[in-house]
Interface confidence: low
């Protein structure tokens, strides 16, 4: 039961090793219950990031020792991951779920590639 | 194993109220929705209410809208149906079932018999 | 409201013989429909999920077919233990919607 999912190509943390992205889903059916996972692949292993489930017209609610944070509108999720180092950098996919009521819908985005490059240490000072 | 047990029915005068219980075991409870169906003497199934796993959305049939009220608390792995303002046509035999959303009902309780009559 | 049309509303037939339940919904529901059996006093009992799969456990002689409005319950050899009566339901959208049911008696 596919449905069409959108999200950036690319992205660059910033120097805190936060990364925020737009997944975009074109809902064909009225949920009221919408699933949100961010998958990360890499090396062809897929894992799960972290998920969250949300009312429509609600926050997003990760669990609290997600690295993920996120907003919802309409059919636009804002997502933000917090943490990253440079070996975190990869493809992060974004997996949207309608999961209520029925019918159900899956869609799955063709990821966006995540740089994370470590600061510099600063140098010691005189 | 899976087990649902309903609990509840009995004999209520037509505008009474009756609260149903089901009781799940053998699964994760809060991951699935849940669904009332009940059936008339000598007649088919009817969708009664369905909730869903975190109790966020709850749907009802036309029939009962607004008497009667779904719930569930994902803490005692309990599914609830309030029914108020009832009358004879909600006398029936009421069926908690595991709801699967698009993959239909996999399992159901027992049922428990509910008599609307004065 | 998605109407569920089932037919026949019953039928007799003998062990060993072929039989087929239909199910036409009033709009596509795609495959989002199953099939139950039920027997007297107890509750009903899953056959066939997303309208062909087969519910584990349940005896291959059972199968189910079809997409969007036109749905069909086939039991290849009728045994003895088959005698129930079969509703399909809709689940693809709310409110649900069973079938008006078919019960398979022994001829």
């Known amino acids: 039961k596919a449905m069409h999912v959108a999200q950036p190509a690319v992205v660059l943390a910033n120097s805190r090793g936060t990364a925020s992205f737009v997944c975009e889903y074109a809902s064909p059916g009225k949920a009221t219950e919408v699933r949100v996972t961010v998958l990360r692949q890499a090396d062809s292993q897929v894992t799960e990031v972290c998920a969250a489930t949300y009312m429509m017209g609600n926050e997003l609610t990760f669990l609290d020792d997600s690295i993920c944070t996120g907003t919802s509108s309409g059919n636009q999720v804002n997502l933000t991951i917090q943490g990253l180092r440079a070996m975190d950098t990869g493809l992060y996919i974004c997996k949207v779920e309608l999961m209520y009521p029925p019918p159900y819908y899956m869609g799955i985005g063709n990821g966006t590639q995540i740089y994370v490059i470590d600061p510099e240490p600063c140098p010691d000072s005189d | 194993e899976v087990q649902l047990v309903e609990s509840g029915g009995g004999l209520v005068q037509p505008g009474g109220s009756l609260r149903l219980s089901c009781a799940a075991s053998?699964?994760?409870?809060?991951?699935?929705?849940m669904s009332w169906v009940r059936q008339a003497p000598g007649k088919g199934l009817e969708w009664v209410s369905a909730?869903?796993?975190?109790?966020?959305?709850?749907y009802y049939a036309d029939s009962v809208k607004g008497r009667f009220t779904i719930s569930r608390d994902n803490s005692k792995n309990t599914l609830y149906l309030q029914m108020n303002s009832l009358r004879a046509e909600d006398t029936a035999v009421y069926y908690c079932?595991?709801?699967?959303?698009?993959?239909?009902?996999?399992?159901w309780g027992q049922g428990t018999l509910v008599t609307v009559s004065s | 409201d998605i109407q569920m049309t089932q037919s026949p509303s019953s039928l007799s037939a003998s062990v060993g013989d072929r039989v087929t339940i239909t199910c036409r919904a009033s709009?596509?529901?795609?495959?989002?429909l199953g099939w139950y059996q039920q027997k007297p006093g107890k509750a009903p009992k899953r056959l066939i999920y997303?309208?062909?799969s087969l519910q584990s456990g349940v005896p291959p002689r059972f199968s189910g077919s079809g997409s969007g409005t036109e749905f069909t319950l086939t039991i290849s050899s009728l045994q003895p233990e088959d005698f129930a009566t079969y509703y399909c339901l809709q689940h693809n959208s709310y409110p649900l919607t069973f079938g008006g049911g078919t019960k398979v008696e022994i001829k």
């Open positions: 997303a309208a062909s």
């Open positions: 909730i869903s796993g975190g109790g966020l959305s709850t």
């Open positions: 079932a595991k709801d699967l959303l698009w993959l239909g009902f996999d399992y």
């Open positions: 053998g699964f994760t409870f809060s991951n699935y929705a």
């Open positions: 709009q596509a529901i795609r495959n989002d």
